[in-house]
Structure formats: C-alpha cells, structure tokens
C-alpha cells in the first residue's frame, strides 16, 4: 500500500530533522509517468544512503520497512518494462530535504494514477 510508504517517509523526515546529514542524492524531480517504476527504483536505492549515513537504528528499520512495502506495491503492478528512462546516475544530485520532497511526489503519483 503506497499510503504506508508515505507514512514511513513522514517518519524518516521526522527522524532526520535533528541530524546533520550532508549527503547529496540522485533525485528525479520531473517523473514521466512511463518512467515512474524506474525512477522509484532509483529512489529506493538512494534511500539506503540515508540509512547508512545516519547510523541510526530507527531510520535503518524504517527505511528497511519502506523498501519492503514499496517493492511489494511495485510487484503487485506486475512486471513493467520501461525503456528510454534515465539511469540513476544521470539524475540531478540534491540534498536530503529536496530528495524526500521528490520521493513523496513520486509516491503520490503512484497513488493518484492507480
């Protein structure tokens, strides 16, 4: 359920508020609907950077749970093959705040277009 993914993103934003994490993360800020699965996979990969950088058990657990929920939601859509989409490394690097903002935006796109 994508709303549960949103809920975990809210938890992560709450948890990182008091931390100083300097990492920049590959961020897709303008997702084309035909590339949303590819973009989501990039977001999930980059999320693990936050988990590692924070060194926080609560963030680690929440990230782990979010990835499981998101992968379950993606697999329920069946095996979607997308072509012509950007590789993660081609995306713009943004700070954590902007990354999470764009992450919420793409999850909302999955909800809105389901």
């Amino acid at each position: 359920n994508w709303v549960n993914v949103i809920s975990d993103l809210k938890k992560i934003e709450d948890l990182i508020q008091s931390m100083h994490i300097d990492a920049t993360l590959y961020t897709e800020s303008d997702v084309h609907p035909s590339c949303k699965v590819t973009a989501m996979k990039c977001f999930l990969l980059e999320l693990q950077v936050i988990s590692l950088e924070s060194g926080d058990a609560s963030i680690h657990d929440t990230v782990e749970n979010l990835i499981i929920l998101a992968n379950n939601s993606l697999s329920s859509n069946g095996n979607v093959t997308e072509s012509g989409c950007k590789e993660c490394e081609e995306l713009e690097e943004k700070n954590i705040k902007e990354f999470l903002q764009s992450f919420v935006h793409i999850v909302q796109m999955f909800i809105n277009t389901s």
Epitope: W2, V3, N4, I6, S7, K10, E13, D14, Q17, S29, D30, V31, H32, P33, L100, Q101, S102, V104, H105, Q108, M109, I111, N112, T113
Partner: antibody
Framework: QVQLQESGPGLVKPSGTLSLTCAVS?????????WSWVRQPPGKGLEWIGE???????NYNPSLKSRVTISVDKSKNQFSLKLSSVTAADTAVYYC????????????WGQGTLVTVSS | SSELTQDPAASVALGQTVRITCQGD??????ASWYQQKPGQAPILVIY???NRPSGIPDRFSGSSSGNTASLTITGAQAEDEADYYC???????????FGGGTKLTVL
Amino acid sequence: QVQLQESGPGLVKPSGTLSLTCAVSGGSISSSNWWSWVRQPPGKGLEWIGEIYHYGYTNYNPSLKSRVTISVDKSKNQFSLKLSSVTAADTAVYYCAREGIGWPSFDYWGQGTLVTVSS
Amino acid sequence: SSELTQDPAASVALGQTVRITCQGDTLRSYYASWYQQKPGQAPILVIYGKNNRPSGIPDRFSGSSSGNTASLTITGAQAEDEADYYCNSRDESGKNLVFGGGTKLTVL
C-alpha cells in the same frame, strides 16, 4: 512568480453546466505540479473539487465525481472545470490553485470567481 | 474517517501565543498544510510539510505534528493575523485532498 486567473460566467441556470477556465502565467502547466479546483460557498469553508496533471491524469472529490470534468490545454497553458447539473448549492467562489511538490499543499491560488446558480 | 477537524473559533491577546489544531487519522501518514484567509481574499499558504514557511511568511508562524494532530502556532500574534485558518491534507486513500472546517481567529 506564478499567477493564476479564473474566468467564466458568473451566473448559471439550475440544471445547467458551470464552465470555468484557469489561465496560468509565469510558469508552465507542464511542470511537475498537479493543478486543482477548490470552491467556497458564501460564509462557508473550502472544498476541494478535483485535480489534474498535464499528462491528463485526474482525481475528483468523490462527492462531486459524477458531475465534474477537469481538462488541460497545454497549448494555451490553462486548465478547465466543468460541473454539470448544478443547483443553488453549487453557488460559491471557485478558485484554481497549483499544488506544491511533495507533501499536500496549494502554493499558488487564483483570486477566485463567484459563480451564482439562479434562474 | 477522512475528515479533518478544527475548532470553529479561537482568540488570542495581541502579542501572545495561540495554537490552532487540526485532527484526523490521515495525519498519521501525511503532514498538513495551513492557509490564512482574510475576508474577500484567496487563501494564502503559511505552512507546509514538517514545518516549512513559504517566502514572505513571518517566522512567528510555525507548524508541528504529533500522532493524528497537526498544529499551527502563532508566537506573538499581531492584529493582521486575525483571519480564518484552514488545514489541508490527503484523505486516508491518499487520492483525495481534504480541508478542515476552518478556525476563525480573533486577535483581542
């Protein structure tokens, strides 16, 4: 600075169709944002009507869904609202608004236009 | 329920602090945003996300969230803060946007 401007008839007859257009300037309707219509009956609170994304995706308030159509015209940088089978209860100030990226918010609003349903 | 509940009215003495609340189950998953609306004017976004202020919004406005409740705090209320305040979020399906019923703030 993004600006939104609603236009359309200020008076609609009962059982008729309310039609409004929102012209977007200072920004592109083909941005990553969703675009919404919100209304406010006189002396009452705000009610979300529906939203559209420039690729044509729409979502509507379940209580209005059977009567609402929102469309987008990218060539004119505008989006439109149609509300059918109107009654006096649809009399309200109608606002168009741009949704922010990420968490729910409306970061830019039109000034609003009063639509009265009366014969 | 996907409703957002606000107290209809609140008051604050000039220069004092007031907190306006918004309750709803959906706020466990989503942050709320807050709008100020003065008579005859369109709403203005004052707080969004965890606690973000758009440019031009005074820093006396702040937002917070706990459980199923979102709060807007005005620290050192000014006469010009007298207005209606609305919260906004998504419903529990995530698909639909919803508003609270609004709180009319009077500055005494």
